[in-house]
């Protein structure tokens, strides 16, 4: 305490010349905001991450921190700067009274402030059964020694680095940032402290039970002996990795974050920055039997978020809870009774369960893939993980009904061969957050920076929506869906694809109103139709039925309701060819599907007609799904007839390039 007071005196003296009053408030419309964890027991009031605007330099960060200290001291408050961030995010970590938040929010350069909060290891329980002697059935899994070109960073508990499984494979860094353990009588037992991290290191790269046996690992301690850490400690750990990467650039990096806390804007932002610096981040979806979007880093779009399934491909139940789910999960992986290194002895094994274990599997698979193809970008890696996953094997009944459509039915698997996937046109489906139920509410789905948005659709459980459209935002196309009055909200669904050297644009036809229907086609030479969207400004789209089949010889055409504007996504890319495939059902049906055949990839999925009884359309793997209202409410008139329209594409260019490599 004495030291702190001394520091204060120096600071106040040093800053006497600075203006005395509050810093000028930021310009209108750029007010800094305060964020805190939505889960009260996980909050850590008194410690705050002050995030500064993107372009802020380290010297400005330090000056802003000193300014806060000086102004707080004038008001009789003690503050302590615990860390100044640079390298990932500009800002600082400060210990201070919550009374100073208003003052801090008005400081120059401040973007937002987040109260610190807890993060937790995502394995339950930690010690189920000891397996001795340490014999693992080696006949079950014997891949090549993969992952040797890749370094995997593990942010977790301390680890037992001399365990036979991981000895010589894991380098323990000197990084440690953990909170004190809870409880006055807590007894630190080395084996307990190392339990979680040791097991996960073993799952990733263990000699006997590891996925990527050739991968080397580096461990950072951000979780204490109770498996608990902080958002701020994790941020400092991520910053440490970024600085290490800059000081000594190596090959591909994978960062495993087998932890979860409440939704954190700052943790997600740090993950985004690290991912954009070329690092692959893999995280646990969380063990809360809840929407993964409510947790961090699981909710960060740039992170590969992994849910847990068991040997029967069922979602893992963990006591009264279980794996998280929803649109923020990228895929699932084994996460129940996973055998791995136990910290109880250097040859012991144990089984643990949780989304941490599932994430470790995917980190291992990612290391294998990156070792085989070190130039893979994050977007390419994610698309490959999705592409090679086992499809539609998870029993969705375990998930809440409203989450089933949003949750990917994918279980991670190693590619049959680590080479030769280059010819494939890879696409994935990205769901937006729910729009909310008000008339003006919209939902936006975005692709990753190096993906192309090839089509856009929308879905509403109530059927009340005003369609969707592709629009430019910050130099990129996004997919925006529009709610309608009385609707419970909409989702936007983007089809995001890897299409090198693509030049895509959106062609729009306004409502035709007087004619039979609205039409738009790709008129530019060499451009092919990859997707159709329709958006209407009227609340009640009439029952007008447009011609479902497009005229012969005009495959590059979107058709729709005469009161809707129609948007065609038109792309030019070397060797790209696309075709339209339709499946119409004359009688009312709750679901109509159409799939692309082998060798073709679904890029667009839409419904005809776009009338109010159609709930929407979305892509599931290579199948276009169109959902309609309950048959009983539709009647059996022709109004119930629905057609699912799929646009299937392939790239001859990618196929040729791949053949040339072989």
């Amino acid at each position: 305490q004495e030291d702190e007071d001394g520091d204060y005196e120096e600071l106040v003296l040093a800053l006497r010349s600075e203006e005395d009053g509050l810093a000028e408030a930021p310009e209108h419309g750029t007010t800094a905001t305060f964020h805190r964890c939505a889960k009260d027991p996980w909050r850590l009031p008194g410690t705050y991450v002050v995030v500064l605007k993107e372009e802020t330099h380290l010297s400005q960060s330090e000056r802003t921190a000193r300014r806060l200290q000086a102004q707080a001291a004038r008001r009789g408050y003690l503050t302590k700067i615990l860390h100044v961030f640079h390298g990932l995010l500009p800002g600082f970590l400060v210990k201070m009274s919550g009374d100073l938040l208003e003052l801090a929010l008005k400081l120059p350069h401040v973007d937002y402030i987040e109260e610190d909060s807890s993060v937790f290891a995502q394995s339950i329980p930690w010690n189920l059964e000891r397996i001795t002697p340490p014999r693992y059935r080696a006949d079950e899994y014997q891949p090549p020694d993969g992952g040797s070109l890749v370094e995997v960073y593990l942010l977790d508990t301390s680890i037992q680095s001399d365990h036979r499984e991981i000895e010589g494979r894991v380098m323990v860094t000197d990084f440690e940032n953990v909170p004190e353990e809870d409880g006055t009588r807590f007894h630190r037992q080395a084996s307990k402290c190392d339990s979680h991290g040791t097991h996960l290191a073993g799952v990733v790269s263990g000699r006997d039970a590891g996925v990527a046996k050739g991968a080397s690992m580096r461990s950072l301690r951000v979780l204490n002996c109770q498996g608990k850490g902080t958002v701020s400690g994790t941020l400092i750990g991520l910053e440490f990795i970024r600085k290490s990467q800059l000081v000594q650039p190596v090959g591909p990096l994978v960062v495993l974050l087998p932890l979860a806390g409440g939704y954190s804007r700052v943790l997600n932002a740090a993950c985004q920055r690290l991912a954009r610096a070329g690092v692959v981040l893999v995280t646990a979806a969380g063990n809360f039997r809840d929407d993964a979007c409510l947790y961090s880093p699981a909710s960060a779009p740039e992170v590969i978020t992994v849910g847990a399934t068991n040997a029967q491909d069922q979602p893992v139940t963990l006591g009264t809870l279980g794996t998280n789910f929803g649109r923020c999960v990228d895929l699932f992986a084994p996460g129940e009774d996973i055998i791995g290194a136990s910290s109880d002895c250097s040859t012991c094994f144990v089984s643990q369960s949780g989304t941490s274990q599932a994430a470790a599997h995917v980190a291992g698979i990612a290391a294998m893939m990156l070792s085989a193809e070190p130039e893979l970008t994050l977007a390419e890696l994610r698309q490959r993980l999705i592409h090679f996953s086992a499809k539609d094997v998870i029993n969705e009944a375990w998930f809440p009904e409203d989450q089933r459509v949003l949750t990917p039915n994918l279980v991670a698997a190693l590619p049959p061969s680590t080479h030769g996937a280059g010819w494939q046109l890879f696409c994935r489906t990205v769901w937006s957050a729910h729009s909310g139920p008000t008339r003006m509410a919209t939902a936006v789905a975005r692709c990753a920076p190096d993906e192309e948005l090839l089509s856009c659709s929308s879905f509403s459980r109530s059927g009340k929506r005003r369609g969707e459209r592709m629009e430019a935002q910050g130099g990129k196309l996004v997919c925006r869906a529009h709610n309608a009055f009385g609707g419970e909200g909409v989702y936007a669904i983007a089809r995001c694809c890897l299409l090198p050297q693509a030049n895509c644009s959106v062609h729009t036809a306004p409502p035709a109103e007087a004619s039979m229907g609205t039409r738009v086609h790709c008129h530019q030479q060499g451009h092919v139709l990859t997707g159709c969207s329709s958006h209407w400004e009227v609340e009640d789209l009439g029952t007008h039925k447009p011609p479902v089949l497009r005229p012969r010889g005009q495959p590059n055409q979107c058709v729709g309701h005469r009161e809707a504007s129609i948007h065609a996504s038109c792309c030019h890319a070397p060797g790209l060819e696309c075709k339209v495939k339709e499946h119409g059902i004359p009688a009312p049906q709750e679901q109509v599907t159409v799939a692309c055949e082998e060798g073709w990839t679904l890029t667009g999925c839409s419904a005809l007609p776009g009338t109010s009884h159609v709930l929407g359309a979305y892509a599931v793997d290579n199948t276009c799904v169109v959902r309609s209202r309950d048959v009983s409410t539709t009647g059996s008139t022709s109004e119930g007839a629905v057609t699912a329209v799929a646009i299937c594409c392939r790239s001859r260019h990618l196929a040729q390039a791949s053949q040339e490599l072989q």
């Epitope: 008339r439 003006m440 009055f485 009385g486 609340e539």
Partner: antibody
Framework: EVQLVESGGGLVQPGGSLRLSCVVS????????MHWVRQATGRGLEWVSG???????SYTGSVKGRFTISRENAKNSLHLQMNSLTTGDTAIYYC????????????WGQGTLVTVSS | EIVMTQSPATLSVSPGERGTLSCRAS??????LAWYQQKPGQAPRLLIY???TRATGFPARFSGSGSGTEFTLTISSLQSEDFAVYYC??????????FGPGTKVDIK
């Protein structure tokens, strides 16, 4: 009791700027679409702009690119930043709410007068 | 945009008499129409929505009808507090939400 109170009106020269605010009470602000509607003296009503709880915005053609609607849900406040004002923007500006169950603007503020004149 | 017209511009009625106000849309707005009442120096008040549903706080003498492009607001027996300007508004196609020019109901 639901209340909407506008402020920020006044006299401004053509080409100038003004920022209107509307502070609400008596309901959960972050659950509702909010709108600005204006009325020139002795004239009818004209919808200007609207904003959804999450910040989705919409404008009438004549103000697009000049006016910006925004909201601070934590502070129960709605704003309208008006730039490049013309004499045609002279009016009483009302903020209004739309309920998800009742279409139309069910609650209005008392209005704030904006006069654009040289 | 959808243009709304109202007739008459002014309606002069004696207290106790019936008042009928018309509103026409340039294209169909289904039943997505509201009526507002505005008294001098006051903000408008939502009177009718969905073309025919009365908003809370207004008595049964106010009724709305119509759909598509033709709408009517009827005040069965005008009371002194009913003398005001009445506006119709469509919210079927937006942006923008559009209002009619108003009908002034004054004392004969």
């Amino acid at each position: 009791e639901v209340q909407l109170v506008e402020s920020g009106g006044g006299l401004v020269q053509p080409g100038g700027s003004l920022r209107l605010s509307c502070v609400v009470s008596g309901f959960t602000f972050g659950d509702y679409d909010m709108h600005w509607v204006r009325q020139a003296t002795g004239r009818g009503l004209e919808w200007v702009s609207g904003i959804a709880p999450a910040g989705d915005t919409s404008y009438t053609g004549s103000v697009k690119g000049r006016f910006t609607i925004s909201r601070e849900n934590a502070k129960n406040s709605l704003h309208l930043q008006m730039n490049s004002l013309t004499t045609g923007d002279t009016a009483i500006y009302y903020c209004a709410r739309e309920d998800i169950a009742v279409p139309g603007f069910d609650y209005w503020g008392q209005g704030t007068l904006v006069t654009v004149s040289s | 945009e959808i243009v709304m017209t109202q007739s008459p511009a002014t309606l002069s009625v004696s207290p106790g008499e019936r008042g009928t106000l018309s509103c026409r849309a340039s294209q169909s707005v289904s039943s997505n129409l509201a009526w507002y009442q505005q008294k001098p120096g006051q903000a408008p008040r939502l009177l009718i929505y969905g073309a025919s549903t009365r908003a809370t706080g207004f008595p049964a003498r106010f009724s709305g009808s119509g759909s598509g492009t033709e709408f009517t607001l009827t005040i069965s027996s005008l009371q002194s507090e009913d003398f005001a300007v009445y506006y119709c508004q469509q919210y079927n196609k937006w942006p923008p939400f559009t209002f009619g020019p108003g009908t002034k109901v004054d004392i004969k």
